[in-house]
């Protein structure tokens, strides 16, 4: 039920995780962690932010987008094959009980031996495809954990968070983002 | 490693409230984790409580939400259940635990609910 | 709230055997499941995550399996100190909820 990402050896990995804050700067902690959702918080954790900044990370493991408007992906650094696994997303919705979990599943490749062009390697590496399809409706609420009646109005995809990339049709069903307010 | 010990009155009378300390040792209780109490009635039927996280943030299980407070001393290393009103219904043993999955806990308190 | 069916509550055994545990929700859970194993006296100690992954020291007889609103756990070649209490666990919605537990014993 994860839904699943690939890169190569040597390149960077991109694991999507957005929400959109209820006011600007009125930001959501949220950690990210190697291994599936545990029942709190993340394990193993690897990156951490708080209501206002980036409170914990590791080497390797940083935001490339801009966190403070929810783009909480993950960005792996130089990824290797132990890399490959299961990674945790975990929005900590302010509210009773209002946790969104997002377990990610990214699979790692070995290099390719002849070096595709730079161009294509560049957005490879920044947002890798997803190897599986999903669909709109249930089978998308699959990666989403419970979502509650209050302080959620909207989920849309990751396209809608990136409709001026020129990557957005490669990558509008391969996410989903958590509206608040 | 994180080592967590309840403590409490054992027994308490109908409509009084119940107050229960776990100490931990080993671990911050600011640094990580929810910090939860769960509860196991006699018949063995687990129930989970609340919990207090590393930040302060609470969490309630909605049946108990008008009785029950978690809180903490983050100077002492402890954090705390309160449940107001109780009946013979919340005669059980409570255990405190903490991890992201559960992966510590104490030993247990019994606590009795009778007049 | 989503409610654990769990199955058997008891159960014999004898060593050796290979048993099965099943657990029922309400509700897809997403493999939002735990497993924990109770012996007399002790607390509960967690077991298997998400379904399949083993707990830090769990032996390898033990075993979880599932998806959508079924989920198992299967202990192969029993031994004497896996006889005990045992629990699922969903946290795919809050209140988290429990099964009601399976006992298994020496036949």
């Known amino acids: 039920s994860e839904v699943e990402y690939r890169a190569e050896v040597g390149q960077n990995a991109y694991l999507p995780c957005f929400y959109t804050p209820a006011a600007p700067g009125n930001l959501v902690p949220v950690c990210w962690g190697k291994g599936a959702c545990p029942v709190f918080e993340c394990g193993n954790v690897v990156l951490r932010t708080d209501e206002r900044d980036v409170n914990y990370w590791t080497s390797r493991y940083w935001l490339n987008g801009d966190f403070r408007k929810g783009d909480v992906s993950l960005t792996i650094e130089n990824v290797t094959l132990a890399d490959s696994g299961i990674y945790c997303c975990r929005i900590q919705i302010p509210g009773i009980m209002n946790d969104e979990k997002f377990n990610l599943k990214l699979v790692i490749k070995p290099a390719k031996v002849t070096p595709a062009p730079t161009r294509q390697r560049d957005f490879t590496a920044a947002f890798p495809r997803m190897l599986t399809t999903r669909g709109h409706g249930p089978a998308e609420t699959q990666t989403l954990g419970s979502l509650p009646d209050i302080n959620l109005t909207q989920i849309s995809t990751l396209a809608n968070e990136l409709r001026d990339s020129r990557l957005a049709n490669d990558l509008r069903d391969s996410g989903a983002t958590i509206r608040i307010g | 490693d994180v080592q967590l010990q309840e403590s409490g009155p054992g027994l308490v009378k109908p409509s009084q409230s119940l107050s229960l300390t776990c100490t931990v040792t080993?671990?911050?209780?600011?640094?990580?984790?929810?910090w939860n109490w769960i509860r196991q009635f006699p018949g063995n039927k687990l129930e989970w409580m609340g919990y207090?996280?590393?930040?302060?943030?609470?969490s309630y299980n909605p049946s108990l939400k008008s009785r029950i407070s978690i809180t903490r001393d983050t100077s002492k290393n402890q954090f705390f259940l309160q449940l107001n009103s109780v009946t013979t219904e919340d005669t059980a043993t409570y255990y405190c635990?903490?991890?992201?999955?559960?992966?510590?806990w104490g030993q247990g308190t019994t606590l009795t609910v009778s007049s | 709230d989503i409610v654990m069916t769990q199955s058997p509550s008891s159960m014999s055994a004898s060593l050796g055997d290979r048993i099965t545990i099943t657990c029922q929700a309400t509700?897809?859970?997403?493999?939002?499941l735990n497993w924990y194993q109770q012996k007399p006296g002790k607390p509960p100690s967690f077991l298997i995550h998400?379904?399949?992954e083993l707990a830090e020291g769990v032996p390898s007889r033990f075993s979880g399996s599932g998806s959508g609103s079924d989920y198992s756990l299967t202990i192969s070649n029993l031994e004497s100190e896996d006889f005990a209490d045992y629990y699922c666990?969903?946290?795919?919605?809050?209140?988290?909820?429990f099964g009601a537990g399976t006992k298994l014993e020496l036949k």
């Open positions: 635990t903490s991890g992201g999955n559960f992966d510590y």
């Open positions: 080993g671990y911050s209780i600011t640094s990580d984790y929810a």
């Open positions: 207090i996280n590393y930040s302060g943030r609470t």
């Open positions: 509700q897809d859970i997403v493999k939002n």
């Open positions: 998400y379904v399949t």
């Open positions: 666990l969903q946290f795919y919605e809050f209140p988290l909820t």
